[in-house]
């Protein structure tokens, strides 16, 4: 998948399995990740558990776990709030669109977290104090999580290597470095840039991510995907002149 | 080996103010530089771990990023602590210890808060 | 919990090889360089040699080098030490430890060489 | 490469005694940024190390308050403030500071 890290930095990811997304001492999160197509290195997410631990008089700990096709509106015993602690409303599950868009708010941490079905995968996105991000008392064990660290780099795709090669050959495959099998031959590199632009007009890192996922995987979806996640950047960043990250010159050979 | 504490450093002395254009670049530069240093001296304890060949890269990356120098001014982390999570002795009435923004208003005029996203392929 | 198991320790005889096994868990264990100590009977404690995280980069102690050979596969959670050429002086308890610097041990796993 | 000599090599102490064992490095292990990387491990009788101390005086996670690290350059102490029965085993200094790592040849702690 695709980060955006609470440093702004912007990596594709090849990781697979599970992996930490987030692991403080209020909060834990994991993903799980699966290849797109049999035998691709790119992979999306098919699992999301995030952990609220117990904190004081406000929320017991709680678990929500979302699956593909099974984006639940509560915690898995049911509830959707903090439990029966004095300040349990201080945790709190909303269902925006049901089966696709569920937003959770936890306020004693100053944190919302946004949870999308998109296709077939999820999509995850999240807006935290600096000292929550950093509320970390074994840096050893929990330190190494990707929404801090990102990915390791033997883990990275660099899709806008991928990107420029398409958008200067006209390929829709890169023959050395492809992180995936040829996906549907119907899916030129003109179409693919026609459909992104359609729903990102600006020509950042979200739209060369969206181009990238549809010459992998030839699913349309994969622009939604896009799509929502800057909306809800959009919604949770709170430097809005960094909404759009832009690529960087120097990755880019053959480019002013 | 403590690399991951550099990172923590680094990451609360800039937080909110490393945009490549911005006008804090000379600050973030020497957060950079501070972060740098406190890499090289991990590096005999963690030289053969993940977490310090992630941190020399990415330092390596937004060097070059920002045009920042290799030697010039450091700086020093900025920290604030935050109540300590699990349960509390204390049993407390009020529910603004449940509502962080209340009770970082005491302390601070306006927490930073950031943002982490993961999507499509 | 951090667990480090060694296997494959044994008799052999001098000039024979030997293939011993740690296998890791309760850790990420490709996230961090290993590792190979070992301690003569009744004697003190002597670096073998370490791995990193990634295998790029090994290190041995000069009373091994080009006999040894470290190796390990993150997939299995599993580090190796190879033996060959192996000499009476070799005879000691095997410990594989976690971290460039070693934190976490296992338990030891015994190598005899005699004829 | 460099040697660690520790002394004594047999240490009986009394219980609820303090004990001190010294390490001498044969050269300096402090960095030219100032750090020192020496650590202490314990070897209870029939058990695998344990690392005690970390960087000459940080105590490792789990490991009891009356054990303490001192020193710098080459004079190094562990030093335990009342000694216990499970206490008993070898403790040795280990240097990351120049390569190869190198051990100290063990000090035996033992009961009088």
């Known amino acids: 998948p695709h980060l955006r890290t609470f440093t702004d930095r912007f990596q594709t990811c090849k990781v697979q399995g599970a992996w930490p997304l987030i692991d403080n001492n209020y909060l834990n999160v994991q993903v799980t990740n699966t290849p797109v197509l049999p035998g691709s290195a790119a992979t999306a997410t098919s699992k999301l558990t995030i952990i609220f631990k117990n904190f004081q008089e406000c929320v017991d700990q709680k678990v929500y776990q979302a699956e593909m096709d099974e984006l639940p509106a509560a915690f898995v015993d049911g509830s959707k709030n903090g439990g029966d602690k004095h300040g349990a409303n201080s945790l709190k599950i909303t269902e925006k669109v049901s089966g696709q868009h569920v937003e959770i708010q936890a306020k004693y941490i100053g944190t919302t977290i946004v949870v999308r079905q998109v296709g077939r995968y999820l999509t995850f996105a999240v807006r935290m104090p600096e000292e929550v991000v950093n509320a970390v008392e074994d840096w050893d064990s929990q330190g190494l999580y990707l929404c801090l660290r990102g990915c390791p780099l033997n883990q990275q795709i660099d899709f806008q290597a991928f990107h420029t090669n398409a958008e200067g050959t006209g390929a829709r495959r890169l023959a050395a470095a492809s992180p995936a099998p040829t996906a549907p031959e119907t899916f030129p590199y003109e179409t693919a840039v026609a459909k992104c632009k359609e729903k990102l007009p600006v020509e950042d890192l979200y739209y060369q991510a969206c181009v990238f996922d549809l010459l992998t995987t030839g699913d349309v979806n994969f622009t939604l995907a896009a799509y929502y996640a800057l909306e809800d950047v959009k919604m949770l960043h709170s430097n809005k002149d960094k909404l759009h990250l832009y690529e960087r010159t120097r990755d880019l050979p053959g480019r002013a | 080996c403590k690399i991951l504490k550099c990172n923590s450093e680094f990451w609360s002395a800039t937080s909110g103010s490393h945009a490549p254009a911005s006008d804090d670049t000379p600050e973030f530069c020497a957060a950079l530089r501070s972060y740098a240093l406190c890499t090289r001296r991990t590096a005999r304890t963690c030289r053969g771990d993940l977490a310090y060949h992630s941190a020399v890269h990415g330092i390596e990356d937004l060097m070059s990023q920002h045009n920042c120098s290799k030697d010039g001014p450091t700086s020093q982390p900025r920290l604030r602590t935050l109540p300590p999570a699990g349960d509390s002795q204390e049993r407390s009435d009020s529910p603004e210890i449940c509502h962080y923004e209340k009770s970082f208003h005491k302390h601070s005029a306006t927490p930073n808060y950031t943002h982490c996203g993961l999507f499509g392929d | 919990e951090v667990q480090l198991v060694e296997s494959g320790g044994g008799l052999v005889q001098p000039g024979g090889s030997l293939r011993l096994s740690c296998a890791a868990s309760g850790f990420t264990f490709s996230n961090y360089g290993m590792n190979w100590i070992r301690q003569a009977p009744g004697k003190g404690l002597e670096w073998i040699g370490m791995i990193y995280y990634d295998s790029s980069e090994k290190h041995y102690a000069d009373s091994v080098k080009g006999r040894f050979t470290i190796s390990r596969d993150n997939s299995k959670n599993t580090l190796y030490l190879q033996m060959n050429s192996l000499r009476a002086e070799d005879t000691a308890v095997y410990y594989c430890?976690?971290?460039?610097?070693?934190?976490?041990w296992g338990q030891g796993t015994m190598v005899t060489v005699s004829s | 490469d460099v040697v660690l000599t520790q002394s004594p090599l047999s240490l009986p102490v009394t219980l609820g005694q303090p004990a001190s064992i010294s390490c001498r490095s044969s050269q300096s292990l402090e960095t030219s940024d100032g750090d020192t990387f020496l650590e202490w491990f314990q070897q209870r009788p029939g058990q695998s190390p344990r690392l005690l101390i970390y960087e000459v005086s940080n105590r490792f996670s789990g490991v009891p308050d009356r054990f303490s690290g001192s020193g710098s350059g080459t004079d190094f102490t562990l030093k335990i403030s009342r000694v216990e029965a499970e206490d008993v085993g070898v403790y040795y200094c280990f240097q990351v500071t120049h390569d190869p790592v190198t051990f100290g040849q063990g000090t035996k702690l033992e009961i009088k």
């Open positions: 430890a976690k971290g460039t610097t070693p934190d976490y």
